[in-house]
């Protein structure tokens, strides 16, 4: 920290001086500093055997300002603190120390975690994520259409990272088998079968998880009664099937 | 003397951030802690943190330790407080002070800020 | 942290009154004899203004109708005899803890 020191007047006599430089208010030739400029802090310093007065503008690292009517002193923080505004409040602890709450402690309370670059005690930060955005089109080899068995992938955020001693993140992508919809490839987009270009258009209501794989479809016989009540028992298999795959990184 | 300028009132949305300035003047820059203290609207005294000027360290207040920066330019003689992610209970004045042998001061003269969607 | 309660909440007063304010910190602010509460005045919108440092000391240019005393945990300011000036409101501060509290604050008010 800066601290600007008063300078001392040099005169012949140890008597008290009026007549001071710098932040001192009162000096003696001998003693320095006797009293100080409002403002400035009192602090004796060592130079040989002797102990001069010096006024400083703030108090060395390591110490701290108390104000009195009179005078205004450094006082020394506590003996594990390296700055302070006093001795119950430390703003940065010695090596091998972390500040809590203006203490220096060996290790951090519950509940906290030290941070070894800071130095300091720490809230234990859990791990949040986003809401789920929504599933990603049933694709099979990039390809949305054809009546193939696909996958779809959904996405959610980290929000917050966590701490070292944190809860980790859960899976942030998830992935899970559907069936691609089901609609003839246009010419580009031609599936490389070709009974799979053979199947009739869906109707208009049905959905890609209620769609059959291609094993129900080759019972045509059937009349459209039987055929619509095979498929609503298909559809149920295939959801209870639907068992989600979850990959992720872990973070 | 010592005289402490603050930068002009704010206007702010939800989720936004501010950044708050005070000016030292009359004084050595690097010889007092600056503090920051808010006053929401008809309310008492808040302390936020202080920063040393010397060295640049920081300390803040539990409650504002993941949301508030303070900065400061020796160059300038300024003091600098950010506060993010905002929201309506933010709305204050929010005031620098000295900080000399535990006690404020001297005091600048205030900031408002009004987080409003 | 340390909790500051003052009291009264608010009171009125007349020019020439005595008043007294007390300050009541959930667990002791001395600390090797010394005391670190403060005392400051506040005007409608105006920053606050030190008057007394150290529990009993006037900071300077303080008029000596204020006075502070008390250690440990209880506290009062006296302003004897109010002035016309005096009508603001007082909070107490603590500075002995991370983190640094105030009380809520006293009115005074005209009678």
């Known amino acids: 920290q800066n601290a600007s020191r008063g300078r001392r007047q040099r005169r012949m006599h140890p008597n008290v001086s009026q007549g001071c430089q710098g932040g001192c208010a009162t000096c003696s030739d001998y003693n320095g500093c006797l009293s100080c400029k409002p403002r400035l802090f009192f602090a004796l310093e060592r130079i040989g055997m002797k102990q001069i007065g010096v006024c400083l503008s703030s108090c060395p690292s390591g110490y701290y300002g108390t104000r009195y009517p009179d005078i205004n002193k450094c006082t020394k923080c506590k003996a594990d603190c390296d700055t302070c505004f006093n001795k119950n409040f430390c703003t940065k602890c010695k090596s091998g120390f972390y500040l809590h709450l203006g203490k220096c402690l060996d290790n951090c309370p519950e509940g906290l975690e030290a941070n070894n670059h800071t130095m300091e005690c720490v809230s234990i930060v859990h791990c949040e994520v986003s809401e789920w955005n929504p599933w990603s089109p049933c694709t099979k080899k990039g390809k949305t259409c054809g009546f193939k068995r696909g996958t779809e992938t959904r996405v959610r955020e980290i929000i917050q990272h966590p701490s070292a001693k944190g809860n980790l993140c859960p899976p942030t992508n998830e992935t899970r088998k559907c069936t691609v919809q089901r609609k003839k490839c246009q010419k580009g987009e031609r599936g490389k079968k070709g009974r799979e270009r053979k199947r009739k258009k869906p109707n208009k209501g049905e959905s890609k998880e209620a769609i059959p794989d291609s094993k129900s479809l080759e019972s045509s016989k059937e009349i459209p009664e039987q055929r619509e009540n095979k498929q609503q028992q298909k559809k149920r298999k295939v959801q209870d099937k639907q068992k989600s795959v979850s990959v992720s990184t872990v973070h | 003397q010592v005289q402490l300028v603050q930068s002009g009132a704010e206007v702010k949305k939800p989720g936004a951030s501010v950044k708050v300035s005070c000016k030292a003047s009359?004084?050595?820059?690097?010889?007092?802690?600056f503090h920051w203290v808010r006053q929401a609207p008809g309310q008492g005294l808040e302390w936020i943190g202080y920063?040393?000027?010397?060295?640049?360290?920081?300390g803040y207040n539990q409650k504002f330790k993941n949301r508030v920066t303070m900065t400061r330019d020796t160059s300038t003689s300024t003091a600098y407080m950010e506060l993010s992610r905002l929201r309506s209970e933010d709305t204050a004045v929010y005031y620098c002070a000295t900080y000399f042998a535990n006690n404020f001061d001297y005091w600048g003269q205030g900031t408002t800020l009004t987080v409003s969607s | 942290d340390i909790q500051m309660t003052q009291s009264p909440s608010s009171l009125s007063a007349s020019v020439g009154d005595r008043v007294t304010i007390t300050c009541k910190a959930s667990?002791?602010?001395?600390?090797?004899?010394?005391?670190?509460m403060n005392w400051y005045q506040q005007k409608p919108g105006k920053a606050p203004k030190l008057l007394i440092y150290a529990a009993s000391n006037l900071e300077s240019g303080v008029p000596s109708r204020f006075s502070g005393s008390g250690s440990g945990t209880d506290f009062t300011l006296t302003i004897s005899p109010v002035q016309a000036e005096d009508f603001a409101t007082y909070y107490c501060?603590?500075?002995?803890?991370?983190?640094?509290?105030f009380g809520a604050g006293t009115k005074l008010e005209l009678k």
């Open positions: 009359g004084y050595t820059f690097t010889s007092y802690t």
């Open positions: 920063i040393y000027p010397s060295n640049g360290d920081s």
């Open positions: 501060q603590q500075s002995n803890e991370d983190p640094l509290t």
């Open positions: 667990q002791s602010v001395d600390y090797d004899g010394d005391s670190y």
